[in-house]
Interface confidence: low
Amino acid sequence: EVQLVESGGGLVKPGGSLRLSCAASGLTFERAWMNWVRQAPGKGLEWVGRIKRKTDGETTDYAAPVKGRFSISRDDSKNTLYLQMNSLKTEDTAVYYCAGSNRAFDIWGQGTMVTVSS
Amino acid sequence: DIVMTQSPDSLAVSLGERATINCKSSQSVLYAGNNRNYLAWYQQKPGQPPKLLINQASTRASGVPDRFSGSGSGTEFTLIISSLQAEDVAIYYCQQYYTPPLAFGGGTKLEIK
């Protein structure tokens, strides 16, 4: 069964850091372009960023609100995707989903909640 | 950046009736190199992650019932549910994956009349 499982969410103070993980199973992880998408409480979906696969240079792209603060990486040997979040702001409070893609986002995790509050 | 605009924001449809959701992109998401539209539709039910319904504007994802269909090209797209079922109550999002930053529409909440 294809599965993505996020972890690492929690409560953090503004200015703090958090690292999210997304463990993949049942798919050829190294082939997938992997994305992070977030959803603030009661709001719509917002794309955070993506990392391409190794053969495409593991290039990363980010949405403007997180550029320079968030960093996406992957470890294909562990089938794991990461989101390093620094300088967190209250507006970063959201459920964070990882989504595996064959271009469109075919597979989604269940999400992990990140709350940024003093 | 490409902006995705969905309409309507919410929609109430009777069971068995047809539901139509529209999505407009601020620039074309049609890639001339292969004549494909990089446009997807997702369904999100309460408390669940989104689920891919349609990619390439009109290709149903595996396991998606055939009452769901997508159409359109370039900048204007439509998701149609031909005969609404109770389990279709959800929020529907369109998304362009033509170029980063990838963008979702604001969502259309579909409920039963």
């Epitope: 050829t28 082939r31 696969r53 053969t55 064959n102 271009r103 | 390439q56």
Partner: antibody, heavy 118, light 107 residues
Framework: EVQLQQSGPELEKPGASVKISCKAS????????MNWVKQGNGESLEWIGY????????RYNQNFKGKATLTVDKSSSTAYMQLKSLTSEDSAVYYC???????????WGQGTSVTVSP | DIVMTQSPATLSVTPGDRVSLSCRAS??????LHWYQQKSNESPRLLIK???QSISGIPSRFSGSGSGSDFTLNINSVEPEDVGVYYC?????????FGAGTKLELK
């Protein structure tokens, strides 16, 4: 178990065209690129190109542009390669090869021998 | 195009020998280098991916190393069934390119 079953040997006259097939089984056909590789008698391997069944996109080695056309039929999980304007230089064994690992060739068909002779 | 150069062209070995096959890329390809074995009258098969990653079902005597432009395939104790031609492949840039091969034979 992944299997790639290629069509049988072909004997063609110069100037003719030939279309060889590669029927895939044991995996989700649309998920991975299908490569085609040429091997002349006693020679090394030469990559012709690949087709991405998900979209039908193709990438070709410049040396084979205009010579080879790669297509797929998703309904039958079959990849095809057509070679046109055949000359003796086209006599070779042609392999289809599946890229489960991006830009590597994890699984190979048994090869199809094409002989071009007057 | 990236040119892949393999050496030696032929290698004569005795069962139990440790052997090293060399592959050089005409420009840096990081670790996007794959190795294949082709036995007589058979299709090639993938031995090593990304320079050093092992493949399920491939005996542990096969290992790979290298990065950038210089790569090595090692067979730590050659078996008679290892006779064949070994090819390296650039997986970095299109067109994908193969080396000319190293023929491994028994003395």
């Amino acid at each position: 178990e992944v299997q790639l079953q290629q069509s049988g040997p072909e004997l063609e006259k110069p100037g003719a065209s030939v279309k060889i097939s590669c029927k895939a089984s044991g995996y989700s056909f649309s998920d991975y690129n299908m490569n085609w590789v040429k091997q002349g008698n006693g020679e090394s391997l030469e990559w012709i190109g690949y087709v991405d069944p998900y979209y039908g996109d193709t990438r070709y080695n410049q040396n084979f542009k205009g010579k080879a056309t790669l297509t797929v039929d998703k309904s039958s999980s079959t990849a095809y390669m057509q070679l046109k304007s055949l000359t003796s230089e086209d006599s070779a064994v042609y392999y289809c090869a599946l890229s489960e690992t991006p830009r590597a060739m994890d699984y190979w068909g048994q090869g199809t021998s094409v002989t071009v002779s007057p | 195009d990236i040119v892949m150069t393999q050496s030696p062209a032929t290698l004569s070995v005795t069962p139990g020998d440790r052997v090293s096959l060399s592959c050089r890329a005409s420009q840096s390809i990081s670790d996007y280098l794959h190795w294949y074995q082709q036995k007589s009258n058979e299709s090639p098969r993938l031995l090593i991916k990304y320079a050093s990653q092992s493949i399920s079902g491939i005996p542990s005597r096969f290992s790979g190393s290298g990065s950038g432009s210089d790569f090595t395939l090692n067979i730590n104790s050659v078996e008679p069934e290892d006779v064949g031609v070994y090819y390296c492949q650039n997986g970095h840039s299109l067109p994908l390119t193969f080396g000319a091969g190293t023929k491994l034979e028994l003395k």
